[in-house]
């Protein structure tokens, strides 16, 4: 038995537990997600049993060998697989647990605006960066763009602080995930805030 | 220096196939998205397609996609172009390419490798 | 897919001269619109990103400006070293696409 393998896919994608065999003579190979059996495998008579037929579809063992390739991949399908070879000639079955992880691709984030305000001809605000369907390990970077500036901000929330009269910056919010990246609309400084200009305190989103 | 070498070029038959590596130097291979893009003689820049860190998402121009396979090997910090059923539309220098900061644009380029298609 | 057209392939200008290379997407792209540069027998090299802003390195001379689907590289003061093509090449939606690039000619 090896060590806990991690392995990411994305919706509608396909992935592959990888699985080398040392084993001579196997009887059957067993494969189990969050102990549910998936797939049974009798080489002998050249057998697959696949439990659910939803997956008969889905499942496939490339060039022949007993690696388990899952298609179609949904958000459902992540959690813990388990391997077993089982073999007259073992005492205890060969066994390999994997871990899959299957994220969403991402679509643009939406970006809302806090309470504004204008102080001194300051606009001071803040810009939250959001997922609208509250996608899972989605990291956020901020990019302000500027004639002045080109500096990159961590976070979902950016605090601005534009004074009228300085060159315009456009902010562009960044949204990745271990499968794809996306970006919002870039939301420019003084379109941003012009609502703030005459009213000391607005609020808009 | 960070750095991306290209091999793997040559003359090929039409129908063919052909395997190009791209070789990742001075930087972390394995935290990046890589692309491959082609020029084919006189021509503007073709971008064929991209493939995450963990090899989990390819992207590819449509057109391009039943013939080309992108795959990567971050132990060997290689990215690979798996061409079949070449053409002699396919004639071009292959470039391979990392995106600035993992965005979108390209800020390093190889020097390319060339293949030729013909019979 | 998005056609990111450059209409002029050839433009020529003198030393010290200014000019200003077009390109124009088939449909709104923002300013997910970068430059490159690529001198003969070199590999491209990135200018300009998000439109407008420069590359680590880039002289100033060069200047993005656009948004939608107009999109213009400025090269102020010209110098020889600046023969060479320069390609647009739009992020927006896949897959990314180029536009066929317009050769700048020193006189």
């Known amino acids: 038995s090896g060590p806990v393998k991690e392995l990411v896919g994305s919706v509608g994608g396909a992935v592959t537990f990888p699985l080398k065999s040392k084993v001579k003579q196997v009887d059957s190979i067993v494969w189990t997600f969050n102990t549910t059996p998936l797939v049974t495998i009798q080489p002998e008579g050249g057998t697959i049993i696949v439990t659910q037929n939803r997956n008969r579809e889905r499942v496939d063992f490339p060039d022949g060998g007993y690696s388990l390739k899952l298609s179609k991949l949904k958000k459902n399908d992540s959690g813990i697989y388990y391997v077993g070879i089982y073999s007259s000639s073992l005492q205890q079955p060969s066994t390999q647990e994997y871990v899959l992880h299957v994220y969403e691709h991402l679509s643009k984030p939406k970006v809302t605006m806090g309470l504004q305000s204008n102080k001194n001809g300051t606009c001071v605000t803040n810009l939250t960066c959001c997922m609208e369907h509250g996608e899972e390990d989605v990291i956020y970077t901020w990019k302000a763009l500027g004639q002045a500036a080109n500096e990159s901000h961590n976070g979902s929330i950016l605090p601005i602080s534009w004074r009228w009269g300085e060159s315009d910056m456009t902010f562009i919010c960044v949204a990745r995930n271990p499968v794809s990246r996306n970006f919002s609309s870039p939301i420019l400084a003084r379109k941003l805030c012009e609502g703030a200009a005459d009213d000391p305190d607005s609020s808009m989103v | 220096e960070v750095k991306l070498l290209e091999s793997g070029g040559g003359l090929v038959q039409p129908g063919g196939s052909l395997k190009l590596s791209c070789a990742a130097s001075?930087?972390?291979?394995?935290?990046?998205?890589m692309s491959w893009v082609r020029q084919a003689p006189g021509k503007g820049l073709e971008w064929i397609g991209e493939?995450?860190?963990?090899?989990?998402?390819?992207n590819y121009t449509p057109s391009l996609k039943d013939k080309f396979i992108i795959s990567r090997d971050n132990a060997k910090n290689t990215l690979y172009l798996q061409m079949s059923k070449v053409r002699s539309e396919d004639t071009a220098l292959y470039y391979c390419?990392?995106?600035?900061?993992?965005?979108?644009?390209?800020?390093?380029w190889g020097a390319g490798t060339t293949v030729t298609v013909s019979s | 897919d998005i056609v990111m057209t450059q209409s002029h392939k050839f433009m020529s200008t003198s030393v010290g001269d200014r000019v200003s290379i077009t390109c124009k997407a088939s449909?709104?792209?923002?300013?997910?619109v970068a430059w490159y540069q690529q001198k003969p027998g070199q590999s491209p090299k990135l200018l300009i990103y998000w439109a407008s802003t420069r590359h680590t390195g880039v002289p100033d001379r060069f200047t993005g400006s656009g948004s939608g689907t107009d999109f213009t590289l400025t090269i102020s003061n010209v110098q020889s070293e600046d023969l060479a093509d320069y390609f647009c090449q739009q992020y927006s939606s896949y897959p990314y696409t180029f536009g066929g690039g317009t050769k700048l000619e020193i006189k």
């Open positions: 001075g930087f972390d291979f394995s935290r990046y998205w």
């Open positions: 449909q709104d792209v923002g300013i997910a």
């Open positions: 390419a990392r995106p600035d900061g993992n965005y979108w644009y390209f800020d390093v």
């Open positions: 493939i995450n860190p963990d090899s989990s998402t390819i």
